[in-house]
């Protein structure tokens, strides 16, 4: 069987060779070939070439689409600004205002309190919280800011925490906490910031912000 296949391949190769040689002879205007024969062979050859070129274009398009699909790694970044809230909740509220960033719909600010991502990956997540407190007016407990994560089907968890003791300055002393780290997030995961006393948070321009970017 293998021998017969080999003979078949050689025959095809020979036919191709003869065909190419005939085209060459047509081109050089060899008189032994009739004009009709040459025209027929030429149009046949042009058809082949056209098919090859069309196939090449299609492949190129497919490849470029594959590349685009592979390169579909858009920048995902968000930076939101603190918003004073009448709510007594310890979760800080944020807004898309001032010099904010929301790169695309692969990250969203939900209910004004959490940044939710649609793509799995490593993210740098950060928060800066500025607060004004006084030792006498505050409880003994320090001011604590927590960066928290809620993944679908999982419990909430604390990713990062920072604590500052209250100032002795009057009426209150301003202090800033910065939290930041790299974490693996699943699709649908939400991150948010919690503080022990939201009433002490400073909402002046640039004081308190929250964001993330996909690495």
């Amino acid at each position: 069987h293998r021998r017969l296949d080999k003979i078949e391949d050689e025959r095809n190769l020979h036919e191709d060779f003869v065909f190419m040689k005939t085209i060459q002879r047509c081109n050089t205007g060899e008189r032994s070939l009739s004009l009709l024969n040459c025209e027929e062979i030429k149009s046949q050859f042009e058809g082949f070439v056209k098919d090859i070129m069309l196939n090449k274009e299609e492949t190129k398009k497919e490849n470029s689409f594959e590349m685009q699909k592979g390169d579909q790694n858009p920048q995902i970044a968000a930076h939101v600004i603190s918003e004073a809230s009448s709510k007594t909740t310890s979760v800080l509220q944020w807004a898309e205002k001032g010099y904010y960033t929301m790169s695309n719909n692969l990250v969203t600010l939900e209910n004004g309190k959490q940044l939710t991502v649609k793509r799995q990956g490593l993210y740098y997540i950060y928060a800066q919280v500025t607060f004004c407190s006084n030792r006498e007016a505050s409880s003994q407990a320090p001011f604590i800011a927590s960066l928290c994560l809620k993944s679908p089907g999982r419990f909430e968890r604390i990713l990062l925490r920072a604590a500052n003791t209250h100032s002795s300055a009057k009426p209150c002393g301003q202090q800033s906490i910065h939290l930041g780290g790299v974490f693996e997030l699943q699709p649908g995961a939400s991150v948010f910031v919690n503080v022990t006393d939201p009433s002490q948070v400073s909402h002046g321009t640039g004081f308190t912000s929250f964001g993330l970017l996909k690495l």
Epitope: S90, V91, I144, S146, C148, L149, S151, R154, F155, E156, R157, I158, L159, N194, V195, T196
Partner: nanobody, 120 residues
Framework: EVQLVESGGGLVQPGGSLRLSCAAS????????MGWFRQAPGKEREFVAD???????EYADSVKGRFTISADNSKNTAYLQMNSLKPEDTAVYYC??????????????WGQGTLVTVSS
């Protein structure tokens, strides 16, 4: 020694209320989430409610709107207020803690449990 002690269980009629308490000792509650679980006769232990150190709460669908979890860190105590009780709430209720940095059911300390019976 790290310990959790539940109290407040008992017999109650359908539609009635109970408040369970869980007294914690030997650790700082603000590093942990406190949770309530329950186990009905012949069934597996199931999640009821959970509270984070900063007060955020989570509930099983079956108890949402009827049960409320809370904590008093100054007293190192977690509570479970149970309203509109149903016969299917009958179970041994356990208090448990989980490290606040862990996001799955890894409760490393458990109480001995308190029995709640809902029956007329």
């Amino acid at each position: 020694e790290v310990q959790l002690v539940e109290s407040g269980g008992g017999l109650v009629q359908p539609g009635g209320s109970l408040r369970l308490s869980c007294a914690a000792s030997g650790f700082t509650p603000d590093d942990y989430a406190m949770g309530w679980f329950r186990q009905a006769p012949g069934k597996e232990r199931e999640f009821v409610a959970d509270i984070m150190p900063y007060g955020s709460t989570e509930y099983a669908d079956s108890v949402k709107g009827r049960f409320t979890i809370s904590a008093d860190n100054s007293k190192n105590t977690a509570y479970l207020q149970m309203n509109s009780l149903k016969p299917e709430d009958t179970a041994v209720y356990y208090c448990a803690r989980r490290d606040a940095g862990i996001d799955f059911y890894y409760m490393d300390v458990w109480g001995q449990g308190t029995l709640v019976t809902v029956s007329s």
